[in-house]
Amino acid sequence: AVNGTSQFTCFYNSRANISCVWSQDGALQDTSCQVHAWPDRRRWNQTCELLPVSQASWACNLILGAPDSQKLTTVDIVTLRVLCREGVRWRVMAIQDFKPFENLRLMAPISLQVVHVETHRCNISWEISQASHYFERHLEFEARTLSPGHTWEEAPLLTLKQKQEWICLETLTPDTQYEFQVRVKPLQGEFTTWSPWSQPLAFRTKPAALGKDT
């Protein structure tokens, strides 16, 4: 038997992936656990193996189909269970009736690239990945720039309240190394949250021209 508190949190990426994290206080040593998904109105069901991500938490991704296929809608309810092996039987450790479009977390933006860089400004673009066509252009973004001598947590957040997959960073210092990240969020869903931050994009501003005022 397992004592202690348990937390089971899952998010839908809006297309064909449900990612889950299960944390359990009284840690289970060497126990095989999985997440099982049973939709109420679909012919498929899916399982993924929970793998440790820390001392007392496990994670896995339920792959529902091809990455850009629309596997669920607003009326779907998916029963998600954490099952752990106890001898020859499986024990239900956690259960939830999951409404996918109330629990959205999109994939991190991808393909970040510097479009144009100058001494004081830099134009950066990116793409969104596996976002449902239901959202059309109605997404919001947050971006942040890492300056020398600062941490990501100190970086001010820039908010883009529309599906704008580029940004022009201004008032940068010449000949300076920066890093840039962006994340995305749809408008829909009571428990919807920001995507993970993108992989950081490193860039360097151009040096100021010699003898010119900077």
């Epitope: 109105r41 679909r42 629309q70 596997k71 809608t73 607003t74 009326v75 779907d76 479009f101 066509h133 239901y134 959202f135 059309e136 252009r137 109605h138 997404l139 749809p186 408008l187 829909q188």
Partner: nanobody, 119 residues
Framework: QVQLVESGGGLVQTGGSLRLSCAVS????????MGWYRQVPEKQRELVAD???????KYADSVKGRFSILRDSVKNTVYLQMSSLKPEDTGIYYC?????????????WGQGTQVTVSS
């Protein structure tokens, strides 16, 4: 402004058939589910049948094998083919559409069409 227009209701004898249709029109939207609900006096509106994207149909137990739902996503129209009708199928039939507008999802209802099955 979104509008749902239902048609096809009427009076029919026990064992007879009817075909309801409901068309959604209006400003820019994406539909992910359309269906039919039934209301009888002193009772809550209840699901008869609906169809979500991916051809995922859901039917009330009481109509399985007798009613069939068909959705035309291009025309934004949903049909309910009702056969082997019974007096207990009598009620006001409402069309419901789940629509995505400007990145948010909402449910929209039609005005209802009366179906009466006489014995």
């Amino acid at each position: 402004q979104v509008q749902l227009v239902e048609s096809g209701g009427g009076l029919v004898q026990t064992g007879g058939s009817l075909r309801l249709s409901c068309a959604v029109s209006g400003s820019h939207f994406i539909s992910d589910v359309m269906g039919w609900y039934r209301q009888v006096p002193e009772k809550q509106r209840e699901l008869v049948a609906d169809m979500a994207d991916g051809n995922s149909a859901k039917y009330a137990d009481s109509v399985k094998g007798r009613f069939s739902i068909l959705r035309d996503s291009v025309k934004n129209t949903v049909y309910l083919q009702m056969s082997s009708l019974k007096p207990e199928d009598t009620g006001i039939y409402y069309c419901k559409a789940g629509l995505w507008i400007a990145g948010r999802h909402s449910d929209y209802w039609g005005q209802g069409t009366q179906v009466t099955v006489s014995s």
